[in-house]
Interface confidence: low
């Protein structure tokens, strides 16, 4: 009977800039799952006695638990679960509809640092010195999953990867995204976007690491051959990636049609719904095929751009061809041309 008291139980805290606080995710037989705060018969707004999660904090090499309850803003990953039975039991869980799930947050005390650490501790359990080399993507607070600054850890050494814009490294980026279980490489992030603009008041855990790596072999097929250690650079870029598995994705819906398979396209990304404005980068039907798929409809029958004679018509704009590639939406404040899409209805 799996519970968070078991020695082989695996958990991590995500969506924060610390391994000791965030949204609780657990590893069950088929991968990582976000735990809904409605689990174990609780209400989604109920706060628990945090001491019940002390084993989770211990396992993450953090201090005592400070709070256990709903996480502030939920970014629902692909898989979220509601569990039943005793608090902390994971032997009877079911997949939850993402829009019904409020994530469970846990905050543990940051570990006491007696001496400055040589590396940032890993996000879950601390590896043994013989642990294989591994990667970590560090997003800014509240930032995206599968987007951020790449850190490479080898044995007890860890740090960022120095990157020159002229480096021809497309194969490497694909390999890294793949290794991180984040799909394929989409684009490089500027450091501010990846969250590395350091604030002097930030905790030491998020100050730059004392080790830095340089790309040694951009065609490498195992991590130990990709990078070599260098003296940390005071200036220069570090490698920061956006991978195709980033979350939260833009969601779409069709409104104002005669069925769920036709209508004006609306989108959202963590906020409320707004009209999607037509974009010159999406003149092909690829974008609309994707929208139709998301509605669980058939392929695109037709799409037409509605006239934007109204200078006050507003909406959101995605500069990429597909919405799934759009890691952020821009606001269009006037002349937003809405798009009416008709998909094949699987249940006419």
């Amino acid at each position: 009977r799996l519970s968070w008291y078991d020695p082989d139980f695996q958990a991590r805290l995500t969506r924060s800039n610390s391994k000791c606080q965030g949204q609780l995710e657990v590893y069950l037989k088929d991968g990582w799952h976000m735990v809904c705060s409605q689990s174990w018969g609780r209400s989604s707004k109920q706060w628990e006695d945090p001491s019940q999660a002390s084993k989770v904090c211990q396992r993450l090499n953090c201090g005592v638990p400070l709070s256990l309850g709903p996480f502030l803003v939920t970014y629902t990953p692909q898989s979220s679960i509601i569990c039943y039975g005793q608090l902390g039991s994971f032997s009877n869980c079911s997949h939850s509809r993402n829009d019904m799930c409020h994530s469970l947050g846990l905050t543990c005390l940051e570990p006491q640092k007696t001496t400055p650490p040589t590396t940032r501790p890993p996000p879950t359990t601390t590896p043994e010195p013989t642990a294989p080399p591994r990667l970590q993507l560090v997003a800014q607070s509240g930032g995206q999953h599968c987007a951020g600054v790449v850190e490479f850890y080898s044995g007890s050494l860890g740090g960022t990867i120095s990157y020159e814009a002229q480096d021809k490294t497309q194969d490497l980026e694909n390999f890294l995204c793949n290794n991180l279980q984040c799909g394929s490489f989409l684009k490089h992030l500027p450091e501010t976007e990846a969250g590395r603009a350091q604030d002097p008041g930030e905790p030491r855990e998020h100050q730059p690491l004392p080790i830095q790596w340089k790309i040694q072999n951009s065609s490498c097929t195992s991590l130990e051959h990709c990078f070599r250690k260098i003296k940390p650079q005071k200036s220069g870029r570090v490698l920061a990636l956006l991978c195709s598995g980033f979350q939260p994705k833009v969601q779409s819906r069709l409104v104002g049609g005669s069925s769920i398979c036709e209508g004006t396209v609306e989108v959202r990304q963590g906020a409320q719904w707004a009209a999607l404005c037509d974009s010159s980068s999406a003149r092909s039907s690829l974008r609309w095929e994707e929208v139709c798929r998301e509605q669980q409809c058939g392929s695109v029958n037709s799409y037409r751009v509605l006239d934007a004679g109204d200078p006050t018509s507003r909406g959101l704009f995605c500069p990429h061809q597909k919405l799934s590639q759009c890691h952020e939406l821009w606001e269009r404040n006037s002349y937003c041309k809405k798009v009416f899409v008709t998909c094949q209805d699987p249940n006419p």
């Epitope: 607070s141 930032g143 906020a271 821009w330």
Partner: nanobody, 112 residues
Framework: QVQLVESGGGLVQPGESLRLSCVVS????????WGWYRQAPGKQRELVAQ???????DYADSVKGRFTISRDNAKRTVYLQMNSLKFEDTAVYYC??????WGQGTQVTVSS
């Protein structure tokens, strides 16, 4: 629930400066683009400036060269530095991200 609190408005003379701040509660701050908007009496609300997560900015023609938008992710704050203020900048100023409901705003009055 995301809360937005705008501040920094006031009464100034033409040519003077103001700095508006908007503090955001909620983890949504870091990964979303932010905008400053304004609404003058009897007019439509308009987008004044916006900034995306990468720090790229965009301004309404009427404020280009005079207003600067910036953000501080650590403080979860978005700023609007307004220089060389004109009478026509008088309005209630709001900060927001696409699709969110509006806060209270902060009044800016330019008068001699």
């Amino acid at each position: 629930q995301v809360q937005l609190v705008e501040s920094g408005g006031g009464l100034v003379q033409p040519g003077e400066s103001l700095r508006l701040s908007c503090v955001v509660s909620g983890d949504i701050f870091s990964f979303i683009g932010w905008g400053w908007y304004r609404q003058a009496p009897g007019k439509q609300r308009e987008l004044v400036a916006q900034i995306n997560t990468g720090g790229l900015t965009d301004y309404a023609d009427s404020v280009k060269g005079r207003f600067t938008i910036s953000r501080d992710n650590a403080k979860r704050t978005v700023y609007l530095q307004m220089n060389s203020l004109k009478f026509e900048d008088t309005a209630v100023y709001y900060c927001n991200f696409p699709g969110h409901s509006w806060g209270q705003g902060t009044q800016v009055t330019v008068s001699s």
